[in-house]
């Protein structure tokens, strides 16, 4: 594929005399695979990032690439590496001819190739600006701490750093790194090729409308006027910004990413590099009405996810689209006609909507956390946005009806004070992608590397399940969900919790003979039930109902139908004591709920009895909810009796930490 | 450090012009504006207006509209600002101050306006 | 723009305490965040002390402290010392510009 411009000084063709025999063989089994973007009109062929195995040094990738080179000039065609990538993932950024994928795919230390694509700026609209003055009284929000000890990094368009909102608050790097800007008659007008940038930025740290008016940003150029970027650009941005962090470490760091573009691998494994050497990134999750799992970097686990809300907390429509929502949302964050600079004029203000603005309130409300508390980790301060949110205040009815259960009724706000959280015993709840409808099919959640993985549960809006179980995967536990025959597949929902010095493990019994039931319990000195978990192998557990549920005076106890395996989650933590609490209906109900009392954190959430007309249970913050089929479909037999078993937990160990600090 | 260092002192006649000069260093100059103050004797501080040295916009005192151009020169780090058609009570000492936030002074330039 | 109103003179024995108020509208201090307080000596530079309310640049004693109720600020310097014997003015933004005070002029007796 020719360059337009003729860019080839050292080129390919001088690389001829490296011989194939060079090369070490791909090891055996593994296959180099190939991604592109599910949006054609977003993909950009001719361009592609080579990402290499993760033990791969600097030295491998330059030779992996002059290797490229040369065996593509043997086959007459040219190529030119535009990077070499270190520092967050090995590997190159090649511009070639999609002919020589197949040649590239078999290189040794090739992990796999994604071809280029687009990232977009996710506020609308960004460059019809309305200029309003600020609409507040400033004295109404001064908060206590305002960020000054946390970095912000913004991945924008260029931004107007001298303006009042944000001048001296703002160094913009010599980072640029964004895409020819589409159509020949495209005119930039530097008000417009910043306005984006300068309005996030005022978001986040604007001296009269910022969230946090003491935190010092660092702007990078990954989006050009059009508010247009590349995946492979923003990818170079975050390698600039774990080098500075390499270079140059300071106190804590958070990344704003107010852009989206379609599922990226790369971009997603970046962000999780990036994550695991302790940065907070906050992104958008998208103005697409749809599922954020869908884009990236919203997909990414480790990354905290925001979708917007107006001033009534309900979803933002943006024209024909809106937020996006889902399992990969963390939270939602105000998002629509937000006041912040204008890069019209020094002194202007605008307003802008979309989850960009959303992203910024979060990524102002972590840089005033970490602030209070540098030490955090990314795990804490999650729990802790998703604690201190405003609850169950958005209507679902907005989002379609399969999304609903999945998509965190969340609004993020300000801790009433910055300090003296320690002693909560934090949990959330991570659902799994769903499983699909074969027999086989199987669902997997996680926690976090630093969560503890208290409970698991199941979902399946067919009710065709055959339960779950906690299993140990790479030294830690998940939780897995199993589709039934005929079941439209399942969701598997994992609570995820904060618990220094844990030490959980997971005991489980087969199936019983009797008719009693199935009960396991925490035998081990000091430990407790944290969750109880079923799974069974037949197709249709029939209407058994185990006669007692928890005998008297035995807590650590999870009881379950005969035919199911029962596994309890049981764990030992410094000061950690939980109860159970149930909630029965003797008559059949859609929805059973039990709650934990002020003080006490939900770690598992479960239903009795286990049988086929339960289509599962699941915690919303500090509730246990337990579905079951329609009503009108079950009759109101016995059968329709469910109870919701819920274990609140609390840890007197955390509690007298944080009396001792205060 | 961060420093502003003016031009010298003028004595100009009425309706002439006046063009004070403000050279920067110690810092990325587009990364702030540019305020200027003036104080004529025994007077306080009057603020005459901003410069954008990241693109050149300005932001003047309305009172001044018209007669005051402010500029700047990236190359070189350096604010300008030309008073034009003077009167004797533009006499005053101009000043050059880093943002709106003027968080950093130039030592003052004295224009004297006399017949 | 109308300047900010500030008192003409205070006066203050060393090791006292003085404050000078501020006073603006609702379209200036009471809405920004940004309220600055400059010591000006005769003949130099003025020095910024205070700025956005209550934030003391590096350099600046710990005795300067500011504060903002409604549509007033306060510039409060205690343990008064001779050195401090100075003009004070105050500055806000207001919608598209910068309004000073008409400077106070502080006697350490």
């Known amino acids: 594929q020719e360059d337009e411009d003729g860019d080839y000084e050292e080129l390919v063709l001088a690389l001829r005399s490296e011989e194939d025999g060079l090369a070490e063989a791909p090891e055996h089994g593994t296959t180099a695979t190939f991604h592109r973007c599910a949006k054609d009109p977003w993909r950009l062929p001719g361009t592609y990032v080579v990402v290499l195995k993760e033990e791969t040094h600097l030295s491998q990738s330059e030779r992996t690439a002059r290797r490229l080179q040369a065996q593509a000039a043997r086959r007459g065609y040219l190529t030119k590496i535009l990077h070499v990538f270190h520092g967050l993932l090995p590997g190159f950024l090649v511009k070639m001819s999609g002919d020589l994928l197949e040649l590239a795919l078999k290189l040794p230390h090739v992990d796999y190739i994604e071809e280029d694509s687009s990232v977009f700026a996710q506020s609308i609209p960004w460059n019809l600006e309305r200029i309003t003055p600020p609409r507040y009284r400033a004295d109404e929000y001064q908060p206590p701490d305002g960020g000054s000890l946390v970095e912000v990094y913004l991945l924008d368009t260029s931004i107007q750093s001298d303006h009042r909102e944000i001048e001296g608050r703002v160094m913009v790097t010599d980072f640029e790194n964004v895409p020819e800007e589409d159509g020949t008659r495209f005119h930039r007008q530097a008000s417009k090729c910043d306005s984006h940038g300068t309005h996030l930025a005022g978001v986040v740290s604007g001296r009269d409308a910022g969230v946090a008016k003491g935190a010092s940003m660092r702007s990078l150029r990954v989006l050009n006027c059009q508010g247009k970027g590349t995946v492979s650009g923003t990818l170079i941005g975050l390698e600039f910004i774990r080098k500075s962090q390499l270079v140059q470490p300071v106190g804590p760091l958070v990344v704003l990413l107010p852009l989206a573009g379609g599922y990226s691998r790369v971009l997603n494994a970046a962000c999780q590099r990036l994550a695991r050497a302790g940065v907070v990134l906050v992104t958008a999750a998208g103005n697409f009405r749809d599922d954020a799992c869908l884009y990236s970097p919203a997909s990414a686990p480790e990354v905290i996810t925001v979708g917007a809300t107006n001033a009534q907390d309900q979803p933002v429509t943006l024209g024909t689209l809106g937020t996006n929502f889902g399992r990969c949302v963390d939270l939602f964050a105000p998002g629509e006609d937000i006041i912040g600079a204008s890069s019209d004029c020094s002194t202007c203000f605008v307003s802008q909507s979309g989850t960009s603005q959303a992203a910024a309130h979060v990524a102002g409300i972590a840089a005033m956390m970490l602030s209070a508390e540098p030490e955090l980790t990314l795990a804490e301060l999650r729990q802790r946005l998703i604690h201190f949110s405003a609850k169950d205040v958005i209507n679902e009815a907005w989002f379609p009806e399969d999304q609903r259960v999945l998509t965190p009724n969340l609004v993020a706000a300000l801790p009433p004070s910055t300090h003296g959280a320690g002693w909560q015993l934090f949990c959330r709840t991570v659902w799994s992608a769903h499983s699909g409808p074969t027999r086989m099919a199987t669902a997997v959640a996680r926690c976090a590397p630093d969560e503890e993985l208290l409970s698991c549960s199941s979902f399946s809006r067919s009710g065709k399940r055959r339960g779950e179980r906690m299993e140990a995967q790479g030294g830690k536990l998940v939780c897995r969900a199993h589709n039934a025959f005929g079941g439209e597949g399942v969701y598997a929902i994992a609570r995820c919790c904060l618990l220094p010095q844990a030490n959980c493990s997971v005991h489980t019994a087969p199936p019983a003979e009797a008719s009693m039931g199935t009960r396991v319990h925490c035998h081990q000195q000091g430990h407790v039930l944290t969750g109880c978990s079923s799974h069974w192998e037949v197709e249709d557990l029939g209407t058994h109902k185990p006669p007692v549920l928890r005998p008297r005076g035995q807590p650590n106890q999870c009881v379950g139908h005969r035919e199911a395996s029962i596994h309890a989650s049981c764990c030992h933590a410094p000061g950690l004591e939980c109860k159970v609490k149930e909630h029965g209906i003797p008559a059949p109900q859609e929805q059973v709920t039990v709650a934990c009392e002020e003080g006490w954190t939900l770690t598992g959430c479960s239903a009795l009895p286990g049988t086929s007309h339960v289509l599962g249970a699941y915690a919303v913050d500090n509730t246990c909810v337990v579905r079951s089929r329609d009503v009108s479909t079950t009759g109101s037999t016995s059968e329709g009796a469910v109870t919701a078993v819920a274990i609140c937990c609390r840890s007197r160990h955390l509690a007298q930490a944080s009396q001792e600090l205060q | 450090q961060v420093q502003l260092v003016q031009s010298g002192a003028e004595v100009k006649k009425p309706g002439a012009s006046v063009k004070v000069s403000c050279k920067a260093s110690?810092?990325?100059?587009?990364?702030?504006?540019i305020s200027w103050v003036r104080q004529a004797p025994g007077q306080g501080l009057e603020w005459m207006g901003w410069?954008?040295?990241?693109?050149?916009?300005?932001n003047y005192a309305e009172k001044l509209q018209g007669r005051v151009t402010m500029t700047t020169d990236t190359s070189t780090s350096t604010a300008y600002m030309e008073v034009r058609s003077l009167r004797s009570d533009d006499t005053a000492v101009f000043y050059c101050?880093?943002?709106?936030?003027?968080?950093?002074w130039g030592q003052g330039t004295t224009v004297t306006v006399s017949s | 723009q109308s300047a900010l109103t500030q008192p003409a003179s205070v006066s203050g024995s060393p090791g006292q305490s003085i404050t000078i108020s501020c006073t603006g509208t609702?379209?200036?201090?009471?809405?920004?965040?940004?309220v600055s307080w400059y010591q000006h000596h005769p003949g130099k530079a003025p020095k910024v002390m205070i700025y956005?309310?209550?934030n003391r640049p590096s350099g600046v004693s710990t005795r300067f402290s500011g504060s903002k109720s409604g549509n007033t600020a306060s510039l409060t310097i205690s343990g008064l010392q001779a050195e401090d014997e100075a003009d004070y003015y105050c500055?806000?933004?207001?919608?598209?510009?910068?309004?000073f005070g008409g400077g106070t002029k502080l006697t350490v007796l």
């Open positions: 500055s806000s933004y207001t919608s598209s510009s910068v309004v």
């Open positions: 956005e309310v209550s």
């Open positions: 101050a880093r943002g709106y936030v003027m968080d950093v």
């Open positions: 410069i954008s040295a990241y693109n050149g916009n300005t």
């Open positions: 609702s379209s200036d201090v009471g809405r920004y965040n940004s």
């Open positions: 110690g810092y990325t100059f587009p990364s702030y504006g």
